[in-house]
């Protein structure tokens, strides 16, 4: 089966790589604009130059193109704790990230929030904090993992999942009490 191609892809596929078909004259292939520039005017004829202009401040194109406008630079979302890793240039969008000892939680494909890496108090680091994943903690005896924090088994209620993790500790306490009564 031939994959479905959009009109623009169909038109571009007629021309060699790095060129696109003139929108008003399909016998002409124009050279695409370099990254950092956009299409101001199509080439007037075969072998003639495409009129490409550099993107203005606050906009960019990251690959060769025949876009009529540059793309607007992304802004890092302060409300999500994001910081700017590198500024927008004519050929590269803004790069946003998180501060040191933070990781990204993605709410959707392009939207992330920065959270502090867990310190694993009352436990040990099983897997270190990474760019897109919090620290994975292993809790000491007498503690259970709740929302990636080690919480004392004294806070474990019967209805919670922690009963399985804290049960050996509870049994040990009972066993010690029993042995003391002999």
């Amino acid at each position: 089966l031939v994959p479905h191609l959009g009109d623009r892809e169909k038109r571009d596929s007629v021309c060699p790589q790095g060129k696109y078909i003139h929108p008003q004259n399909n016998s002409i292939c124009c050279t695409k604009c370099h990254k950092g520039t956009y299409l101001y005017n199509d080439c007037p004829g075969p072998g003639q130059d495409t009129d490409c202009r550099e993107c203005e401040s606050g906009s960019f194109t990251a690959s060769e193109n025949h876009l009529r406008h540059c793309l607007s630079c992304s802004k890092c979302r302060k409300e999500m704790g994001q910081v700017e890793i590198s500024s927008c240039t004519v050929d590269r969008d803004t790069v946003c990230g998180c501060r040191k000892n933070q990781y990204r939680h993605y709410w959707s494909e392009n939207l992330f929030q920065c959270f502090n890496c867990s310190l694993c108090l009352n436990g040990t680091v099983h897997l270190s904090c990474q760019e897109k994943q919090n620290t994975v903690c292993t809790c000491h005896a007498g503690f259970f993992l709740r929302e990636n924090e080690c919480v004392s088994c004294s806070n474990c209620k019967k209805s919670l999942e922690c009963t399985k993790l804290c049960l050996p500790q509870i049994e040990n306490v009972k066993g010690t009490e029993d042995s003391g009564t002999t």
Epitope: H105, W107, S108, E109, N110, L111, E147, N148
Partner: nanobody, 120 residues
């Protein structure tokens, strides 16, 4: 068919409280980030609060921090928004949304909204 049905809106005096609910069906609720988005009269959409499936990660807009609390009950496929110390500027239509789907066919994953009016 994806369905998100909000309830709990109404008229409340400044300083009052409301609890919004959103019953979800037609998709695996436990796999998705969920949230509340609002639209005040004549204004654009504003993110209010998000929550991830295990309720570990939450987001609150600065304008509602300390007053609103988001929660979810995965066993009931329901999302909640507890709204305390309500202000006139909280007046808006509140939409329940599958946040994970932002940027795709987002409006397939939104409810019809529930109106919250804060007025004396």
């Amino acid at each position: 068919e994806v369905q998100l049905l909000e309830s709990g809106g109404g008229l409340v005096q400044p300083g009052g409280s409301l609890r919004l609910s959103c019953a979800a069906s037609g998709f695996t609720f436990t796999r998705y980030n969920m949230g509340w988005v609002r639209q005040a009269p004549g204004k654009g959409l504003e993110w209010v609060s998000f929550i991830d499936p295990p309720s570990v990660h939450t987001y609150y807009a600065d304008s509602v921090k300390g007053r609103f609390t988001i929660s979810r009950d995965n066993s009931k496929n329901t999302l909640y928004l507890q709204m305390n110390s309500l202000r006139a500027e909280d007046t808006a239509v509140y939409y329940c949304a599958n946040i994970s789907q932002f940027g795709s066919n987002a409006f397939d994953y939104w409810g019809q909204g529930t109106l919250v009016t804060v007025s004396s």
